[in-house]
């Protein structure tokens, strides 16, 4: 059966939106008015992985782009990147682990934990206009909580 996907946007708990800031980079900043259409639309696919009531494995692709968020080691540090894939083969139910995030719902907020690197989360900075990154701390300065907005296909 084909993998189930939905289209959505994400905002961090400070209401910063995510935009493409480079061919393989996202950043977070406050948008308003017409600028809101600049935010990236994700195609969130529900993939194979360890699942529980509040933890669901997903892959985060960019809608209509052959790009997925992935987690890799760079200079011995878990790092978030946008990775180009062959559209003929993606999305698929059994995604490679670097593409998988555990979507964790707590108090109507979402966290995205790397399946490859447990306790590392998709994060944004408090500061405006900074790259989205993989952070190894929760509850500190950096933001790991998001809200999801559904987008019609």
């Amino acid at each position: 059966a084909p993998v189930r996907s939905l289209n959505c946007t994400l905002r961090d708990s400070q209401q910063k939106s995510l935009v493409m800031s480079g061919p393989y980079e996202l950043k977070a900043l406050h948008l308003q008015g017409q600028d809101m259409e600049q935010q990236v639309v994700f195609s969130m696919s529900f993939v194979q992985g360890e699942e529980s009531n509040d933890k669901i494995p997903v892959a985060l692709g960019l809608k209509e782009k052959n790009l997925y968020l992935s987690c890799v080691l760079k200079d011995d540090k878990p790092t978030l990147q946008l990775e180009s894939v062959d559209p003929k083969n993606y999305p698929k139910k059994k995604m490679e682990k670097r593409f998988v995030f555990n979507k964790i719902e707590i108090n109507n907020k979402l966290e995205f934990e790397s399946a490859q690197f447990p306790n590392w989360y998709i994060s944004t900075s408090q500061a405006e206009n900074m790259p989205v990154f993989l952070g190894g701390t929760k509850g500190g300065q950096d933001i790991t909580d998001f809200t999801m907005q559904f987008v019609s296909s």
Partner: antibody, heavy 116, light 110 residues
């Protein structure tokens, strides 16, 4: 809006910088593209300066052009122009609508003539 | 990669007639296609984006369709003011690309 400037007659090999001045939107949010059009020919994409500051180039343009920006301007440097670079150069804002890149609005263009 | 082939290169149409311009992408671009109109000596103007959405202020005589690799721009009830060159543009990828535009179609109105 966007408006180009700096186009002029130059001799081959003389570096030239074109400037795109933007107003009404932020270069922290929007990517800007450069496109050129040789006399009587079609539109040819040169490259982008992304909102994060990195540049992407058409495969043929790498090494020949450099795109950079300040808070309100985007520069296109033609490092060593040849007669083949004679064209009208346009800049445009890149709108990302559901991740799809669309060019709007466009500037009126600035003419570069390369001749000895 | 992502080469855009536009046909025909030129077409002559009578006032009130209909013209169809085709654009083919060498790889799947979903709905990531825009169409622009350029009149001689002027800047290009966005007509249609996301394959079929009309840009603000563009008359409904213009319509776009298609997805994947095959796309069409149709202009009906042609007016003299529609004489221009029309370009398609893929907006999906900017990596290792020669040109994001098709070669253009000149529409001559008789």
């Amino acid at each position: 809006s966007v408006e180009e400037s700096g186009g002029r007659l130059v001799t081959p090999g003389t570096p030239l910088i074109l400037t795109c001045t933007v107003s009404g939107f932020s270069l922290d949010v929007y990517t800007v593209t450069w496109v050129r059009q040789a006399p009587g020919k079609g539109l040819e994409w040169i490259g982008y300066i992304w909102s994060g500051g990195s540049a992407s180039y058409a495969s043929w343009a790498k090494g020949r052009f450099t795109i950079s920006k300040t808070s309100t301007t985007v520069d296109l440097k033609i490092s060593s122009p040849t007669t083949e670079d004679t064209a009208t150069y346009f800049c445009a804002r890149v709108k990302m609508i559901s991740n799809i890149e669309t060019f709007d609005p466009w500037g009126p263009g600035t003419l570069v003539t390369v001749s000895s | 990669a992502y080469d855009m082939t536009q046909t025909p290169a030129s077409v002559e149409v009578v006032v009130g007639g209909t013209v169809t311009i085709k654009c083919q992408a060498s790889e799947r671009i979903y709905s990531g296609l825009a169409w622009y109109q350029q009149k001689p000596g002027q800047r290009p103007k966005l007509l249609i984006y996301r394959a079929s959405t009309l840009a603000s202020g563009v008359p409904s005589r213009f319509s776009g369709s298609g997805s994947g690799t095959e796309f069409t721009l149709t202009i009906s009830d042609l007016e003299c003011a529609d004489a221009a060159t029309y370009y398609c543009h893929q907006g999906v990828s900017s990596s290792d690309i020669d040109n994001v535009f098709g070669g253009g179609t000149e529409v001559v109105v008789k």
